[in-house]
């Protein structure tokens, strides 16, 4: 089939395009090209007769077209008007016509864009800025870059006007960045120069340094003020409300008690017109004052926050002392004292760090104590506990579940059933339950102060019939004469009888066997190797009874005192000595031999061929059980006679 391929399909203005013909029939008389989707004499571009190799321009010929013998058409110096469809009309020798249509699109080469802004000096948290990418170009795509990255997702960033305009609402100082726009069309892409947004902000609340507020008479007072601001702030100082000077630093030498008072730093931004002040109270002491403790965090979060307790006032050449719970400081990697001992930092506080804390200032005559300070440590919630612990309930009873999680402040609770929220209470009560109340019951504990949440999920089954039980154990490999083992029959269910069997028999009477927890738990105290039996638990209620699969207790024991065989101790010279050692043990022990105290081999059997009187001596077998950590040995004297 006759087809036309445009190379390229998207053509830049001023460039050229080739309309390439595929599957041209044989035995042709000639062909003509037309502008448009159909053959129209008024829109003929050029005709070509193969026999004469003669090309004839038509009404739509612009002088920029070249036709090739293979019927392909080259159009040069493309203009916007050239966009559209082109139809090739082929006349075969048998005068049967065939047509094919192709098309291309013309796009301009884009100029380098530039950014215009409606506000060159926007004010933080007040102004919006609209950047517009110039010029406006048809069929162009507009893109934006911030610090050479694509636009971040933000409710304060809005694109409009076909992405040509980028608006930043409520600008912040963090919007101070390099902005670029890019225009793209199918034939070109251009990026603008960067525009730096200059956001006016501040002044923030000034910071007065040093933080030290207590001074002794005779010292120099040197206060510095700083406030984040663009443009930089202008500073003024006031003492007890009276203007002092317009500088960033305030210096008063050789202060006295009269210099005590409120020191105010005022920061002013002439562009935003805003003022902010910070006041610090300076106390000049003639004598060391009664100390007091300040904290940088009155409600620290457990395992998250550090707390710095500072003993005030700061007095040069003074010894600071600390007490916790009326004791001197314990040694702990979480407790750190500053070089001057004035600040006690608790790293990663825990709920046990509440205190009380006291600090003291030591002078020539005595130690002045501060009042005690107690920390309010926010913690939790821990994993909630749902009680009671039953997992099986029979239909018709009331279901009453209570949830508790250690938390400060106390947790807020929510209950979910199969993921659906039920109520925001600590207790969940459902009367007259049915099988439909079976499901996953989730208690969610939330600490509003720390923002932490923890959940516990409990599967509740409502069924008159009990499941097949199983046995859980708190110790899968107990050691003889040392460990106790508690077997528990699962699940825990209301109105249920629990039964136990050992090796298919009901429980023997023994002071080492104890039933507890409504017969649900069977405890074996001081296990022995004879307790290595098959244990089965059973549950029964009004409509069902079931036994668990047996659980066999694997008791680790030994090694017992070994036995060396044969028992003979006298041998004739030339005989073979073949000693075997055995010790009752679980797991099997490791064996080793020593002859006259000298280590030999790590085997159960010791073999020496053709012994002589030189082989007289003590033969010791050593046994070791790695699981119980116990060892044993036996010594045998061997006499070889000539």
């Amino acid at each position: 089939k006759l087809t036309i391929e445009s190379t390229p399909f998207n053509v830049a203005e001023g460039k050229e395009v080739l309309l390439l013909v595929h599957n041209l029939p044989q035995h042709l008389f000639g062909y003509s090209w037309y502008k448009g989707e159909r053959v129209d004499g008024n829109r003929q571009i050029i005709g070509y007769v193969i026999g004469t190799q003669q090309a004839t321009p038509g009404p739509a010929y612009s002088g920029r077209e070249i036709i090739y013998p293979n019927a392909s058409l080259l159009i040069q110096n493309i203009i916007q008007n050239d966009t559209g469809f082109y139809t090739l009309h082929v006349i075969k020798s048998d005068l049967v016509n065939e047509e094919a249509t192709g098309q291309f699109r013309v796009y301009p080469e884009l100029p380098k864009p530039s950014i215009s802004s409606n506000n060159s000096k926007p004010v933080e948290d007040k102004d919006a800025v609209a950047f517009t990418c110039e010029p406006e170009t048809q069929d162009a795509t507009y893109l934006w870059w911030v610090n050479n990255q694509s636009l971040p997702v933000s409710p304060r960033l809005q694109l409009s006007n076909g992405n040509r305009t980028l608006t930043l609402f409520n600008v912040t100082r963090n919007d101070t960045a390099s902005y670029k726009c890019e225009t793209q069309n199918p034939v070109s892409a251009r990026r603008s120069d960067s525009v730096i947004l200059n956001v006016l902000y501040g002044p923030d609340a000034p910071t007065i340094s040093p933080l030290n507020t207590s001074y002794r008479s005779g010292e120099n007072l040197n206060l510095s003020c700083h406030a984040a601001s663009n443009p930089p702030a202008q500073y003024s100082w006031f003492v007890n409300g009276t203007f002092q000077q317009s500088t960033q630093e305030l210096f008063i030498p050789n202060i006295t008690v009269n210099n005590s008072g409120s020191y105010t730093c005022q920061a002013h931004n002439s562009d935003t017109g805003l003022n902010r002040t910070t006041v610090t109270t300076i106390t000049v002491y003639a004598e060391p004052p009664k100390p007091f403790i300040t904290s940088n965090n009155s409600n620290p979060v457990e395992d998250e926050d550090a707390v710095a307790l500072t003993c005030e006032p700061e007095i040069q050449n003074t010894t600071y002392l600390w007490w916790v719970n009326n004791q001197s400081l314990p040694v702990s990697p979480r407790l750190q004292l500053s070089n001057d001992n004035r600040t006690l930092t608790l790293l990663s506080v825990t709920r046990n760090d509440v205190g009380p804390y006291e600090c003291g200032i030591q002078n020539e005559l005595s130690v002045d104590h501060s009042d005690p300070v107690i920390l309010n440590v926010l913690y939790g919630p821990d994993d909630p506990t749902i009680s009671p612990s039953y997992t099986y309930y029979r239909p018709g009873v009331n279901l009453s579940l209570s949830c508790h999680a250690a938390s400060n402040p106390p947790a807020q609770y929510s209950w979910l059933i199969d993921g659906n929220i039920q109520q925001h209470t600590q207790e969940l009560f459902i009367s007259n339950i049915t099988e439909k109340n079976s499901g996953l019951y989730t208690c969610q504990a939330n600490n509003s102060a720390s923002g932490h949440s923890r959940t516990t999920v409990k599967t509740i089954t409502v069924s008159a019939e009990l499941p097949k039980p199983s046995i859980s154990s708190n110790n899968s490999k107990p050691v003889e004469d040392k460990d106790a083992v508690a077997f528990t029959c699962e699940p825990e269910a209301q109105n249920t009888t629990y039964l136990w069997w050992v090796n298919g028999q009901s429980l023997p009477v023994s002071p080492r066997l104890q039933l507890s927890n409504g017969n649900r738990t069977l405890t074996l105290f001081n296990v022995t190797r004879n307790d290595a039996r098959a244990y089965v638990c059973g549950i029964q209620n009004s409509v069902s009874a079931n036994r668990s699969d047996p659980v066999t207790l694997d008791v680790l024991y030994g090694p017992d005192t070994p036995i060396i065989s044969p028992p003979d101790s006298s041998y004739l010279s030339g005989a073979n000595l073949n000693l075997s050692c055995h010790s009752a043990s679980n797991p099997s022990p490791q064996y080793s031999w020593r002859i006259n105290g000298i280590p030999q081999q790590h085997t159960q059997v010791l073999f020496i061929a053709k012994i002589t009187p030189n082989n007289n001596g003590t033969y010791a077998c050593f046994v070791s059980n790695l699981a119980t950590g116990r060892n044993n040995s036996i010594v045998k004297s061997i006499t070889v006679s000539a």
């Epitope: 239909p395 018709g396 089954t461 069924s463 008159a464 097949k468 039964l499 009901s506 409509v543 069902s544």
Partner: antibody
Framework: QVQLQQSGAELVKSGGSVKLSCTAS????????MHWVRQGPEQGLEWIGW????????EYAPKFQGKATFTTDTSSNTAYLQLSSLTSEDTAVYYC?????????????WGQGTTVTVSS | ENVLTQSPAIVSASPGEKVTITCSAS?????MHWFQQKPGTSPKLVIY???NLASGVPARFSGSGSGTSYSLTISRMEAEDAATYYC?????????FGAGTKLELK
């Protein structure tokens, strides 16, 4: 060996009542639950309910609430089923049965059944 | 209440033939139990908790299923197996039985 011996057949007038007994041997009824099941002529099995002889707790099928009453006498190791306001629909064989506590089987021990015929 | 539907109602089988009886519950149950009853006798438990063989029951009996669909299978029919078989659920009150399937010897 466990056995449940039920009382003999009963012929009762419509509107009357009857008390059936089931005496256990080979085990203590306080250690288990006693269930009652009935079977109408040429019909299937119908569960009536159970009693816990240890504390007198009962559970009845809704259909038999007010119709059947369970009691026990632990001194004679006997369970009783009283039926009231009898109609011809109550003509059936009534079975007692229990699940042994020493194993996983329930409805394993059955009485031989008591035939109750209600005449008009 | 949970209605149990047994099928077929009546089935005939030759000695040695495999027989399967099904029981469908109107609501999901945790297990199914099967009883055998011969004329003039009390019911006898054959399968408990879906698939466990009751004491003294031949190994040719087996049970399976879950949710709402359960079955009892006799791998090779014998003359003594001719009886009516009932399924029973104990998950919810009231406890209910199926209407029964009568197994006849062909």
């Amino acid at each position: 060996q466990v056995q449940l011996q039920q009382s003999g057949a009963e012929l009762v007038k419509s509107g009357g009542s009857v008390k059936l007994s089931c005496t256990a041997s080979g085990f203590n009824i306080k250690d288990s639950y006693m269930h009652w099941v009935r079977q109408g002529p040429e019909q299937g099995l119908e569960w009536i309910g159970w009693i816990d002889p240890e504390n007198g707790d009962t559970e009845y099928a809704p259909k038999f609430q007010g119709k059947a009453t369970f009691t026990t006498d632990t001194s004679s190791n006997t369970a009783y089923l009283q039926l009231s306001s009898l109609t011809s629909e109550d003509t059936a064989v009534y079975y007692c049965n229990e699940g042994t506590p020493d194993g996983p089987y329930y409805f394993d021990y059955w009485g031989q059944g008591t035939t109750v015929t209600v005449s008009s | 209440e949970n209605v149990l539907t047994q099928s077929p109602a009546i089935v005939s089988a030759s000695p040695g033939e495999k027989v399967t009886i099904t029981c469908s519950a109107s609501s999901s149950v945790s297990a199914m139990h099967w009883f055998q009853q011969k004329p003039g006798t009390s019911p006898k438990l054959v399968i408990y908790s879906t698939s466990n063989l009751a004491s003294g029951v031949p190994a040719r009996f087996s049970g399976s299923g879950s949710g709402t669909s359960y079955s009892l299978t006799i791998s090779r029919m014998e003359a003594e197996d001719a009886a009516t078989y009932y399924c029973q659920q104990r998950s919810s009150y009231p406890l209910t039985f199926g209407a029964g399937t009568k197994l006849e010897l062909k």
